[in-house]
């Protein structure tokens, strides 16, 4: 048998905020006319299911968000590459669980400058996961221990910190007409998750009094 890595490499899920994309690379002997077909299944199931819309494709990604939408389930996906010359190779992912493996994007935050304070309002983060009644769940719905960590860089040596589960925060006692750098992260201790930071550079308003 030939080495499957000649045609196909690095088959893996890339998951952000529960959007689960299967990606892969062609091997050294892959060509632009190599076609890829994708299948998926859940833990312990015998049969692989062909993913509609991802059969004999030439791109190197396939969106499996809907098919892998149960965040308590374990999933696998596999890719079969077929070259123009008729050679084929199949590779599968490791077990994938979105709750465990999804990475968190930076939160969506509005930073509002005031004269002696900066207010930060964190907006709920929607996910593609739907509740029983059809509405989309937010990260906050899914991770019950989710909290926000906020930091305000006052100068090179001094930072102010706030944190909690609420959505509205305010840093008080600031100097008017001064620029501050705010960073806001989502933290989920149970799953040891931290989002990339949202950053806002904000100048407090001048004191007109």
């Amino acid at each position: 048998p030939e080495d499957p890595s000649d045609l196909l490499q690095h088959v893996k899920f890339q998951s952000n905020n529960f959007e689960n994309i299967l990606t892969w690379d062609s091997g050294p002997e892959g060509t632009p006319d190599t076609v890829y077909s994708i299948e998926y299944k859940t833990y312990g199931e015998r049969d692989w299911v062909a993913k509609k819309g991802c059969q004999r494709i030439t791109r190197k990604s396939c969106n499996l968000t809907v098919e892998t939408g149960n965040h308590t389930e374990l999933y696998y996906a596999r890719v079969t590459a077929v070259s123009a010359g008729g050679r084929s190779a199949t590779k599968m992912t490791d077990r994938f669980n979105s709750l465990q493996h999804t990475a968190l994007k930076p939160p969506d935050v509005t930073c509002i400058p005031k004269v002696r304070s900066i207010q930060m309002i964190v907006h709920p983060t929607p996910t593609p996961i739907r509740a029983g009644d059809g509405h989309r769940l937010t990260l906050e719905d899914i991770f019950h221990d989710l909290f926000y960590h906020l930091e305000l860089q006052v100068n090179r040596t001094y930072q102010m910190h706030l944190g909690g589960e609420q959505r509205e925060y305010e840093f008080f006692g600031l100097t008017p007409d001064t620029e501050f750098l705010g960073t806001i992260m989502i933290c989920v201790p149970t799953w040891s998750k931290k989002s990339a930071p949202y950053m806002c550079r904000v100048r407090t308003l001048p004191d007109r009094t």
Epitope: P4, V11, K12, T42, G44, R46, N70, R78, T90, M92
Partner: antibody, heavy 116, light 113 residues
Amino acid sequence: EVQLVESGGGLVQPGGSLRLSCAASGYSITAEYMNWVRQAPGKGLEWIGEINPSTGTTTYNQKFKGRFTISVDQSKNTAYLQMNSLRAEDTAVYYCARFDAYFDYWGQGTLVTVSS
Amino acid sequence: DIVMTQSPDSLAVSLGERATINCKSSQSLLYSSNQKNTLAWYQQKPGQPPKLLIYWASSRESGVPDRFSGSGSGTDFTLTISSLQAEDVAVYYCQQYYSYPFTFGQGTKVEIK
């Protein structure tokens, strides 16, 4: 037709090492998980560990971690079980078995005897 | 580790009669994602590797005669051979795949009375 054929068993002295092979045919080894299971003479079945042949990711029964190593050569469509520091109680028939939860195809097994 | 305990250790049944093997797990095998039980049954004849009979506690493997059936949920499971045939003489094992390490029962030997 899916077939698994083990080889590499035999007599080995206590403290010695042995590498077992499991040649897969009838399918690409990278398309399903592969496991090793052993059975001591007249005894029950004991799961050693598994490998995802596509990624090389392994999970072991803690009892065997450190002494036994599972690997794959994709180009040969073959899985391996490297066994080190062997003791008399490792005497058993060693099977490779396919799938990720339960085991749908098994090899015929290869006998490993650890004795001085 | 999940401990799997089979009973009886051996069983002698007349040809054409029903054989019942029990398997008890030390914790529930109910998999919350699909509400199925992560239990498999195997048959092993002398000098041969085990053969998969049943998975998900009650799903019969392709090609397995319908006299073999699996039932049970949670921690208590049963393999039933509805009408024992001569070729069913073997050792039968249950196996859990709920969590690592996967573990087997000690086996039940089925003989003809």
